[in-house]
Interface confidence: low
């Protein structure tokens, strides 16, 4: 018997359904009752979900696991993950036994998008060229970590005095906290770009400067 | 075989500078998010600095090496780098290079490098 | 930033023996813990993540357990090449990544 997955990792989003596909060729006259199916976690070898004695054993990975029952005759050994967790993420592997077996692993990616980032001035009165003023960009309960970019208004990145830290909450989403200090032009503008690298997720969040009021 | 290899550790002066360099091989280095670690004579470890996955990532720094260091990374040559400016008796240590565990994510690290000597004295 | 209390410093038992080494942060890390097993001139080996799932090729005789500020690392049963130091280390809010002290385990 073959088995086969994807070779891209899947991308799940937080709280949502994922599908780790894998399929093998079923010989002419195969019955479930043939069908040894495993599911486990590679690194770990810890039981996810099982198929074995025609029937299926269930989900061995807080009951959040699912096969496709109607599909595994045609050999559709596909598990369905339910409510995505952070600490779902990583390698599984798909184990199919007939009369020899084969096995395959699939890698679960998991994100969530990063919220529009606010922005904070300190101080944020009585402003003149020549200040020097922090500027700090918030964006929050993203996965992965996320990558955060300065720019000036003419799109010139601005690399030095930033100074990023993430924190994670107890879900394992990040919170992330980039910290700008600039000396003021005339006027300008300052944006932040915080990027979710799996899901190319780019969210943006800006502040004028142009004397008073201040312009977010 | 998943490897990490330092190397540009040595002896050198109180307010010199230092390149090390961490060589990967058997796995692909650009998915992983990578930490230099130190660890001082007789001492237990210190997390130095980390860098993300992209050539333009977020680069982390402890407080005690922060606007002295600079990590980088060249995916194209499978490398993570350590400069070292300003170099103090302080900073005495073996470095070890770290590859976290997961791709995209700072958490744990499941590989090391055997680590690079550094002395500063005079 | 997050400290991380090993206790106690050094463990002096014998072969066979059961091990348990405490690391407490000083505020709550999730489950976002893992430890390390260092032998002299070797580089750290990760044996612990997510305060109690055993890193790939780690023996069923390390066990991680707790959640929040307080966990433990146990050895059921120490063998001759389980003397180290043993490490924890919490990556929950960074940077900075941030080690305990350390606690040794020695032949008594």
């Known amino acids: 018997v073959e088995v086969q997955v994807s070779e891209d990792p899947v991308v799940a989003l937080v709280d949502t359904d994922a599908t780790l596909r894998c399929s093998f060729s079923p010989e002419p006259g195969f019955s479930l009752a043939q069908l040894n199916l495993i599911w486990q976690l590679t690194d770990t070898k810890q039981l996810v979900h099982s198929f074995t004695e025609g029937r299926d054993q269930g989900s061995a990975y807080s009951n959040r696991t699912a096969l496709f029952p109607d599909l595994l005759v045609q050999g559709n050994a596909s598990l369905r993950l339910q409510r995505v967790r952070v600490t779902d993420e990583g390698s599984y592997t798909c184990f199919v036994s007939i009369q020899d077996f084969d096995s395959a692993a699939v890698s679960l990616q998991v994100a969530a998008p990063y919220s529009k980032p606010s922005m904070t001035l300190e101080p944020n009165k009585d402003l003149r060229p020549g200040n020097m003023v922090t500027i700090t960009c918030s964006s929050y309960q993203g996965y992965p970590e996320a990558e955060v970019f300065w720019k000036d208004g003419q799109g010139v990145p601005l690399t030095g005095n930033v100074t990023t830290s993430q924190m994670a909450n107890e879900r394992g989403l990040f919170d992330v906290h980039s910290v700008l200090r600039v000396v003021l032009g005339a006027n300008g503008t300052y944006s932040c770009l915080v990027r979710n690298p799996v899901l190319q997720q780019d969210a943006h969040g800006s502040v004028t400067i142009t004397g008073q009021p201040l312009t977010f | 075989e998943v490897q990490l290899l330092e190397s540009g550790g040595g002896l050198v002066q109180p307010g010199g500078s230092l390149r090390l360099s961490c060589a990967a091989s058997?796995?692909?280095?650009?998915?992983?998010?990578m930490s230099w670690v130190r660890q001082a004579p007789g001492k237990g470890l210190e997390w130095v600095s980390g860098?993300?996955?992209?050539?333009?990532?977020?680069?982390y720094y402890a407080d005690s090496v922060k606007g002295r260091f600079t990590v980088s990374r060249d995916n194209s040559k499978n490398t993570l780098y350590l400069q070292m400016n300003s170099l103090r008796a302080e900073d005495t240590a073996v470095y070890y290079c770290?590859?976290?565990?997961?791709?995209?994510?700072?958490?744990?690290?499941?590989?090391w490098g055997q680590g690079t000597t550094v002395t500063v004295s005079s | 930033e997050i400290v991380l209390t090993q206790s106690p410093g050094t463990l002096s038992l014998s072969p066979g023996e059961r091990a348990t080494l405490t690391c407490r942060a000083s505020q709550s890390v999730g489950d976002f813990l893992a430890w390390y097993q260092q032998k002299p001139g070797q580089a750290p080996r990760l044996l612990i993540y997510?305060?109690?799932t055993r890193a790939a090729g780690i023996p069923a005789r390390f066990r991680g357990s707790g959640s929040g500020t307080d966990f433990t690392l146990t050895i059921s049963s120490l063998q001759s090449e389980d003397f180290a130091v043993y490490y924890c280390?919490?990556?929950?809010?960074?940077?900075?990544?941030?080690f305990g002290g350390g606690t040794k385990v020695e032949i008594k």
């Open positions: 997510g305060a109690s």
């Open positions: 058997g796995f692909t280095f650009s998915d992983y998010y």
């Open positions: 770290g590859r976290d565990r997961s791709p995209y994510q700072y958490r744990s690290m499941d590989v």
């Open positions: 860098i993300s996955i992209s050539y333009g990532g977020n680069a």
């Open positions: 280390q919490q990556y929950k809010n960074w940077p900075p990544l941030t």
